[in-house]
């Protein structure tokens, strides 16, 4: 399979982990498919619940994925940016606050591009809860870890921020920051952070992030 | 820096094709992005007639879409424009253009600075 | 295809004036709507795109504000190297299209 979309399709629409392929090759990958969220299909390529895996880590890591799938984990950019240039993906990406709320921004069209081009995202047709404005720059930025600072400031902010994310200078998002728990949330330049949502000092509770055929 | 030129004949016939060509350089069509044919009508009116992506797929204004082919020849970083059946009413300013994304329609950040095209016998 | 309704057509301002080009769309673009700037004999140049990203090296006195239907640009201060068409367009869906143009005359 290629992605959850194509494992819901085989008939298997149980949530859980599943054996992946990369496009055009015979590598593997294992991720969590929601089989359930919005019709399902949907391959989860982030998640954030609970602090227990340690997301500041290497460009390599963000390469090629790290954490648990049924956990918080991180996909892997390369499998993702093959993936999503092989045909038109959506992106919804899944918020909690500490508060009870939810919210989501749901992007129609995905892609990430190659490692050569430093995985840059790119990003159109935004809508949903969390914001009239992306929280991701438009257009998008390249990829950024402690050991590879493509961002757009001075500053290092994969290292000021912490996690690899794709840092403008710094912007208004990083999913991959510090998790922190309820009641030290707050005025944290280091959190988890959806900027047109919550603001620039708010830390969320838990974040997905997913993406699926526009086809499907 | 990244630069487009246009290219081509500035005068066809009635029902002949137009061909031109958009030459790039400072950055690979194959590397990311989408390449676009963009024409201007006398009165400056702007219709968008389609693209190449940097992986070759082609997206193509439904209003031209039965005698419009956009191709491209990587060794040289050049993509073609070719119009067939073309009439007076495809007089225009002719524009090559490069798009902010690379999978569907975007704005567009890089412009060649155009050719004039005129149809007429 | 979606329709942009660009007003208005003609702007005669004087230099340091203020001005605003709205543009309204058939159905919603999201927030997927950029502005160029035409100056006599040369081809269009990106301003805005995402509807309020100002591109690299504008100056800040070009803004865009809008998402939906309703999309404004306004230049806080002209200038008389402003003189130009300015059209704004939509990539939500294909085919992208474009506005009609504004086109700023300078008093």
């Known amino acids: 399979f290629r992605d959850c979309a194509e494992v819901f399709k085989s008939g298997h629409t149980t949530n859980g982990i599943y054996t992946l392929t990369f496009p055009n090759s015979t590598e593997e990958i294992k991720a969590y498919c929601d089989m359930e969220a919005g019709g399902g299909g949907w391959t989860i390529i982030q998640r954030r619940e609970d602090g227990s895996v340690d997301f500041q880590r290497t460009w390599k890591e963000y390469k090629v994925g790290f954490g648990n799938p049924s956990g918080e984990y991180w996909l892997g950019n390369e499998f993702v940016s093959q993936l999503t240039n092989q045909q038109r993906y959506v992106l919804k990406i899944h918020l909690k606050d500490w508060e009870g709320n939810e919210a989501y921004s749901l992007y129609e069209h995905f892609y990430l591009s190659s490692e050569e081009l430093n995985y840059r995202i790119h990003l159109k047709g935004l809508t949903g809860t969390a914001g009239k404005i992306s929280s991701i720059s438009q257009p998008g930025n390249d990829f950024s870890t402690k050991d590879g600072d493509n961002d757009k400031c001075i500053c290092k902010c994969s290292q000021m921020l912490t996690g690899g994310w794709w840092f403008d200078a710094c912007g208004a998002s990083n999913l991959n920051g510090m998790y922190y728990p309820q009641r030290q949330n707050t005025n944290k330049f280091n959190g988890i952070k959806w900027y047109y949502w919550k603001g620039s000092g708010y830390s969320l509770k838990a974040t997905t992030m997913m993406i699926r055929p526009a086809d499907f | 820096d990244v630069q487009l030129q246009e290219s081509g004949p500035g005068l066809v016939k009635p029902s002949q094709s137009l061909s031109l060509t958009c030459t790039v350089t400072?950055?690979?069509?194959?590397?990311?992005?989408?390449w676009n044919w963009i024409r201007q009508f006398p009165g400056n009116k702007l219709e968008w007639m389609g693209y190449?992506?940097?992986?070759?797929?082609?997206s193509y204004n439904p209003s031209l879409k039965s005698r419009i082919s956009i191709t491209r020849d990587t060794s040289k970083n050049q993509f073609f424009l070719q119009l067939n059946s073309v009439t007076p009413e495809d007089t225009a300013t002719y524009y090559c253009?490069?798009?902010?994304?690379?999978?569907?329609?975007?704005?567009?950040?890089?412009w060649g600075q155009g050719t004039s095209v005129t149809v007429s016998s | 295809s979606i329709v942009m309704t660009q007003t208005p057509k003609l702007l005669l301002v004087s230099a340091g004036d203020r001005v605003t080009i709205t543009c309204k769309a058939s159905?919603?673009?999201?927030?997927?709507v950029a502005w160029y700037q035409q100056k006599p004999g040369q081809s269009p140049k990106l301003l805005i795109y995402?509807?309020?990203n100002r591109y690299t090296g504008v100056p800040d006195r070009f803004t865009g504000s809008g998402y939906g239907t309703d999309f404004t640009f306004a230049i806080s201060t002209v200038q008389a190297e402003d003189l130009a068409i300015y059209f704004c367009?939509?990539?939500?869906?294909?085919?992208?299209?474009f506005g009609g143009g504004t086109k700023l005359e300078i008093k």
């Open positions: 159905q919603s673009a999201s927030n997927d």
């Open positions: 253009a490069r798009s902010t994304f690379g999978h569907y329609v975007s704005s567009m950040d890089y």
């Open positions: 400072g950055y690979s069509i194959t590397s990311d992005y989408a």
């Open positions: 995402y509807a309020s």
């Open positions: 190449i992506s940097y992986s070759g797929s082609t």
């Open positions: 367009q939509q990539d939500y869906s294909s085919p992208p299209t």
